[in-house]
């Protein structure tokens, strides 16, 4: 639901996210199989939507930022992963400006997906009123594709 | 402790809707997620689906569209409703909790066995 | 769907005898060096009783008679010794991927 860029953008998009690698060659002590992905995307993906939607009639007219680029899969395993990692600080950053009840149970349940001792990037937000809440509504809009991509991804294995 | 509890009737008529309930004390549905699975005479498992502590479902494909969970938190209380049940549906039913993430399915019901037969 | 095999169907033991069941899965049931696959014990007019998750780990309250074992596709539940009260059939169940599984199951008994 890329509304301001077109399939070519958001096809570089997945590509340039598939390139985005682990920070650690280290496998974390426990990580969930895909079942549990899957549980977790289901969960995430009704928040997304929904907090993605309330944005779009709150703030009409926001266009999407160019200058934003959510890497938000990893390439280490087949079907492709949340990069939890490197989403988690975009919400934290987003959190005091949107809906704070829904963001957390999206870092909640992003928490849960995320590399143990993965370090995490500080994000900040623009200072600018009408760039940040073009910063706000890019997130929110790449984080909804990524969700459908892994889920189509997760869908269309062996199950 | 966790306790869960499968109620229902024990004997349905073949193209009928077989509903059963399972009532869980000790824990909160609205936290983890919620299973049902059935043991066939012949003492084969078969997983049937959830119902997320959000309420989110998954259903076994294997069922196709016949089959669906709902839930009442009020009553803490999760369903099971199979539609169009033939005697290949005669099966011990049970109810069972999966807490947590990569763990298992650590309580379970007693069971409640049903037979669909004319 | 991963499909799991076990064998024997049916064992019969000795008391105080070691007693080994295999489960092998279609396809590998394993992330980052986790096997998502669990043992239940299942008796009579009983519901299954976990006993082991994630391959190796002793579920609290099980007497350490019990052990698994395995990795990826090949997987071994060991009872060691086996005492009268250990008669049920066993099941191997994995939840790596949608939809759970569970194995055919191998009834124990007493020689």
């Known amino acids: 639901m890329l509304s301001h860029t077109g399939p070519s953008r958001f096809a570089l998009f997945l590509l340039c996210s598939m390139e985005t690698l682990l920070s650690s060659h280290m496998a974390p002590t426990h990580q969930l199989p895909p079942s549990d992905v899957r549980k977790i995307i289901l969960e995430l993906q009704p928040l997304s939507r929904g907090l993605l939607e309330d944005y779009q009639k709150k703030e009409t007219g926001v266009p999407e930022s160019n200058r934003t680029l959510l890497l938000c899969l990893t390439s280490d395993s087949q079907p492709p992963r949340l990069n939890s990692s490197a989403i988690l600080p975009y919400f934290r950053a987003i959190r005091p400006l949107s809906d704070k009840n829904i963001i957390d149970k999206i870092i909640e349940q992003l928490d849960k997906l995320k590399f143990q001792h993965e370090p995490e990037t500080e994000i900040s937000v623009p200072a600018d009123t009408f760039e940040c809440k073009s910063f706000i509504l890019t997130i929110l809009q790449q984080f909804s594709a990524c969700l459908e991509s892994v889920f189509k991804s997760l869908n269309s294995g062996p199950q | 402790e966790v306790q869960l509890q499968e109620s229902g009737p024990s004997l349905v008529k073949p193209s009928q809707t077989l509903s059963l309930t399972c009532s869980v004390t000790?824990?909160?549905?609205?936290?983890?997620?919620w299973n049902w699975i059935r043991k066939f005479p012949g003492n084969e498992l078969e997983y049937m689906g959830y119902?997320?502590?959000?309420?989110?479902?998954y259903y076994n494909p294997s069922l196709k569209s016949r089959f669906s969970i709902t839930r009442d938190t009020s009553k803490n209380q999760y369903y099971l409703q199979l539609n169009s049940v033939t005697t290949e549906d005669t099966a011990t039913y049970y109810c069972?909790?999966?807490?947590?993430?990569?763990?298992?399915?650590?309580?379970w019901g007693q069971g409640t066995s049903v037979t669909v037969s004319s | 769907d991963i499909v799991l095999t076990q064998s024997p169907a049916s064992l019969a033991v000795s008391l105080g005898q070691r007693a080994t069941i295999s489960c092998r899965a279609s396809?590998?049931?394993?992330?980052?060096?986790?096997?998502?696959m669990h043992w239940y014990q299942q008796k009579p007019g009983q519901p299954p009783k976990l006993l082991i998750y994630r391959a190796s780990n002793l579920e609290s309250g099980i007497p350490a008679r019990f052990s698994g074992s395995g990795s990826r596709t090949d997987f071994t539940l060991t009872i060691n010794p086996v005492e009268a009260d250990d008669i049920a059939t066993y099941y191997c169940?994995?939840?790596?991927?949608?939809?759970?599984?569970f194995g055919g199951g191998t009834k124990l008994e007493i020689k």
């Open positions: 119902i997320s502590y959000s309420g989110i479902t």
């Open positions: 169940q994995q939840s790596y991927e949608d939809p759970w599984t």
């Open positions: 000790g824990d909160s549905i609205t936290s983890g997620y």
């Open positions: 069972a909790r999966y807490g947590n993430y990569g763990y298992a399915m650590d309580y």
């Open positions: 396809e590998s049931v394993d992330t980052y060096g986790n096997s998502f």
